[in-house]
């Protein structure tokens, strides 16, 4: 190889060992008869050399630095050439560095040809290995503006006082153009301006200077976004830190087209604007930091640009002004992310404050809109607290647990509507009465409706799940001892059509000691499957539950247990079951930890099944499944 550098080129070439590899044989640069591991070639010099090995790219790297002095004479503006041409250089990983020094009053603009640049953060790399590292200067301090790959949106970077630009090309890359040009501009009066141009839908992740280290103190950095008129942009902060300010406040400022309050000033912890039409600017302003404990200011953010959907132009009013203790959250459904560009899915408050999730609280009217390619990517979860603090006032009081019609007007699916029902301890209990009798969901007879009610204890220390219930069964009411949550969970969009079938009434009733009582009136046409709460995890220790099973006058009920034995092993106490005829009060007691469960048995009259648990040994829990069938009395049952 021969490298001869023109003396006025201000180019220096350095060939040196790259990152050490575990290659057995060393490799040398051979110049005449000498072997060396480092070679520096300065302007006006001419060097002939070879390598002592077959694959020098595994050992050496080459750096080509060009110093461009804009202080003492005119600046060589225009397209930047790769000099020496890559065809004249040995095939090593190569880094071209351009170091431009200019007066503070001169703005320098780097212009990148298509396919533009994409900024990447720590720990990332470029697919083709081609990277641009761009630094600026504040007095004598070098400031890293960022590291970039090809195929992005960054079209121009404006700086002043100087630029250091490094283009890294892997040895196998055929590229022979720099891909950028330099132009002079008037002073930009800030650290830098990064222009990001979107041609269509897409996203860009950008970072403050020096990221992930701290942004220079009291500096200003601006990003200019060029957005096609028919698209919308949303900003979200992926990661940020605030420093300790002595004077002024760290903030971001937006110049948004059509805004009457430009610049719009936001704290970094605020929700950032979304659903913006047209070009906009975002600026990061640092502060005077505490000298003793400066901390660091840093910001990594994403701009997402996408088509507004039909829904984006609609404003939905969610009137929670008459509601109490209610919160409505619209959020993304959990889905596996694909690797390709996924348009954002945002919900916007007052059309501007957009985020991936939004919680609305009671007491106000809220105006919301959506910026989302597919609203099935979102769902809605509502929580409402109904509490009684004074037992004398609440007793016998009833509340309807019904999804408000306002919610059906929203274009997103309801996932959960949870009512937290809170009662004064040991004073009141609750009864749930459905508009339509309920079926308990079991493996043997699963619910196939578009929604279910999930009933669980709402006492933090108690892990008690009564079960999942859907309309179309035999359970007339559920009585529970204390605080519970009732969650209406939807399973299909057809819930909107079936909404009329929903409806539970909750009433506060005098306190009783059992954890739960289910009132069951079996249907003559089908089996009623019933199972103990906390199925698969076992009925909690020392818990008691009952089923009040009504038998119509002309029917006989057959009670059948799923297993011969419960399998429960008691650590302390006894687990037992009482089956009691309601008319005669005759009862049978079964020891669940010792006895076999009774064989199928017939009841001519209504009866109780009561199960009381001991403190079971771990892994030997009490789970019980049974079913009831009715047959007409005329049939000979013997």
């Amino acid at each position: 190889f021969e490298i001869a550098l023109p003396r006025e080129s201000n180019i220096t070439v350095l060939i040196k060992l790259g990152t050490p590899t575990l290659l057995a044989k060393p490799c040398y640069i051979v110049i005449s008869k000498r072997h060396t591991t480092m070679l520096s070639i300065k302007p006006g010099e001419r060097i002939l050399f070879t390598f002592s090995c077959q694959s020098p790219e595994n050992h050496f790297v080459i750096e080509i630095q060009k110093n461009i002095d804009c202080m003492s004479g005119p600046c060589p503006f225009g397209e930047v050439q790769l000099q020496p041409s890559t065809s004249l250089l040995p095939t090593l990983n190569r880094t071209f560095i351009w170091d431009v020094k200019a007066h503070k009053s001169i703005g320098l603009e780097l212009q990148f040809s298509i396919p533009r640049l994409r900024q990447f953060g720590p720990g990332e790399s470029c697919p083709d290995g081609v990277t641009y590292s761009i630094s600026g200067r504040i007095d004598a301090t070098v400031v890293r503006i960022g590291t970039f790959c090809s195929n992005g949106t960054v079209s121009r970077i404006k700086m002043q006082e100087g630029v250091k630009m490094a283009l890294h090309l892997p040895w196998f890359h055929p590229r022979n153009v720099s891909g950028f040009s330099i132009a002079n501009r008037s002073s930009i009066k800030r650290l830098c301006i990064i222009e990001s141009v979107f041609e269509g839908e897409g996203s860009a992740t950008l970072m403050s200077a020096n990221y992930p280290e701290g942004f220079p103190e009291d500096e200003l950095m601006t990003w200019q976004f060029v957005i096609p008129a028919h698209l919308r942009a949303s900003v979200s902060f992926l990661n940020f830190n605030l420093s300790n300010c002595e004077r002024k406040e760290e903030r971001v400022e937006y110049y948004i087209p059509g805004s009457t309050t430009n610049p719009e000033v936001f704290k970094l912890e605020d929700k950032q604007p979304g659903n913006m039409a047209g070009n906009f600017n975002l600026s990061l302003q640092g502060c005077d930091q505490d000298a003793q404990n400066p901390g660091i200011l840093r910001l990594q953010f994403q701009v997402l640009v996408q088509h507004p959907q039909n829904e984006s132009n609609k404003i939905y009013v969610v009137d929670l002004s008459n509601e109490r203790a209610t919160s409505l959250t619209i959020e993304p459904r959990p889905v596996k992310q694909s690797r390709k560009f996924v348009p954002g899915c945002f919900v916007c408050l007052e059309s501007r404050t957009c985020s991936t999730n939004l919680t609305l609280t009671s007491g106000s009217k809220h105006k919301i809109s959506f910026l989302c390619d597919n609203l099935t990517r979102l769902w809605m979860n509502v929580e409402k607290n109904i509490s009684c603090t004074d037992h004398r006032y609440c007793q016998r009081k009833s509340y309807s647990l019904q999804v408000p019609s306002d919610i059906f007007h929203l274009p997103v699916e309801l996932h959960d509507f949870s009512w937290k029902l809170l009662v004064p301890k040991d004073r009141l209990s609750l009864v749930l009465v459905p508009a339509q009798k309920l079926q308990q969901h079991t493996h043997e007879k699963p619910c196939n409706t578009s929604f279910s009610y999930l009933v669980a204890s709402a006492i933090p220390s108690q892990d008690l799940y009564f079960g999942s219930f859907c309309p179309g069964g035999s359970i007339e009411q559920i009585q529970v001892k204390q605080n519970i949550s009732v969650t209406l969970r939807t399973f299909a969009p057809s819930f909107r059509q079936e909404a009329s079938r929903q409806g539970l009434t909750v009433s506060f009733i005098p306190y009783f000691k059992e954890e739960g009582v289910f009132t069951v009136t079996p249907d003559t046409k089908s089996k009623v499957y019933l199972r103990t709460p906390n199925w698969d995890r076992g009925l909690p220790s020392l818990t008691s539950v009952s089923w009040n099973i009504s038998v119509p006058r002309d029917q006989v009920a057959c009670l059948t247990f799923f297993k011969e034995r419960t399998g429960v092993v008691c650590q302390t106490g006894r687990a037992f079951m009482i089956i009691q005829e309601q008319r005669t009060r005759a009862e049978e007691i079964f020891s669940l930890d010792e006895d076999a469960l009774p064989k199928p048995r017939f009841h001519h009259h209504s009866f109780w099944v009561n199960i009381s648990n001991c403190s079971p040994a771990s892994g030997k829990q009490l789970d019980l499944l049974f079913w009831v069938t009715l047959t007409p009395r005329t049939v000979d049952l013997t």
Epitope: I31, S32, L39, S40, E45
Partner: antibody
């Protein structure tokens, strides 16, 4: 045997032009950098210009920049020096010299020289 | 530009005696490759210059071994172990490190 033979020298008036040639033989001309070096009567040697193998890069001593142009024709194994706006101080014997095939700018072969006299 | 300074400018020598010429550069000629880019030429009367020494100490082909070059950085020496009458002429040092290529003023060797 390597040979370099200069021609084209002569008497020229100040401000005038002259074109020197150097015919190369005995080596692969297109593989070597070539130079012009001059020597004023009774004085030392002064490097004037050089040209890369393919003619893509050229360099000149400051005193001749913008007035002299070095060029080559690899097909004809020839090196040229086009001199214009000649001055009295350009009077010298002009040698063409080959850069040896190793690092640096060492001249391993020189021509016999051609005299250029600038005088009115 | 790198300035080359030779001394002495004139050197009368008796045949068979050694001779030594010094050359100093305004900047180090020692390259990162480990080579000193300094050459010595002899221009015999009425002839064109001929290369004696390149890279500070390497003799050019056909050059008698009584000629040797030494030195590094900025100070270099050409030695002739036993001067012969055919060695008469002007000796030039030249920096071959970078353009513009520059020569010393020359040292005239003459027989006493």
């Amino acid at each position: 045997e390597v040979q370099l033979v200069e021609s084209g020298g002569g008497l020229v008036q100040p401000g005038g032009s002259l074109r020197l040639s150097c015919a190369a033989s005995g080596f692969t001309f297109s593989r070597y950098w070539m130079n012009w070096v001059r020597q004023a009567p009774g004085k030392g040697l002064e490097w004037v210009a050089n040209i890369k193998q393919d003619g893509s890069e050229k360099d000149y001593v400051d005193s001749v920049k913008g007035r002299f142009t070095i060029s080559r024709d690899n097909a004809k194994n020839s090196l040229f020096l086009q001199m214009s706006s000649l001055r009295a101080e350009d009077t010298a014997v002009y040698y063409c010299a080959r850069v040896m095939y190793s690092s640096g700018w060492s001249f391993d072969y020189w021509g016999q020289g051609t005299l250029v006299t600038v005088s009115s | 530009d790198i300035v080359m300074t030779q001394s002495p400018l004139s050197l009368p020598v008796t045949p068979g005696e050694p001779a030594s010429i010094s050359c100093r550069s305004s900047r180090s000629l020692l390259h990162s490759s480990g080579y000193n880019f300094l050459d010595w030429f002899l221009q015999k009367p009425g002839q064109s210059p001929q290369l004696l020494i390149f890279l500070g100490s390497d003799r050019a082909s056909g050059v008698p071994d009584r000629f040797s070059g030494s030195g590094s950085g900025t100070d270099f020496t050409l030695k002739i172990s036993r001067v012969e009458t055919e060695d008469v002429g002007v000796y030039y040092c030249m920096q071959a490190l970078q353009t513009p290529i520059t020569f010393g003023q020359g040292t005239r060797l003459e027989i006493k």
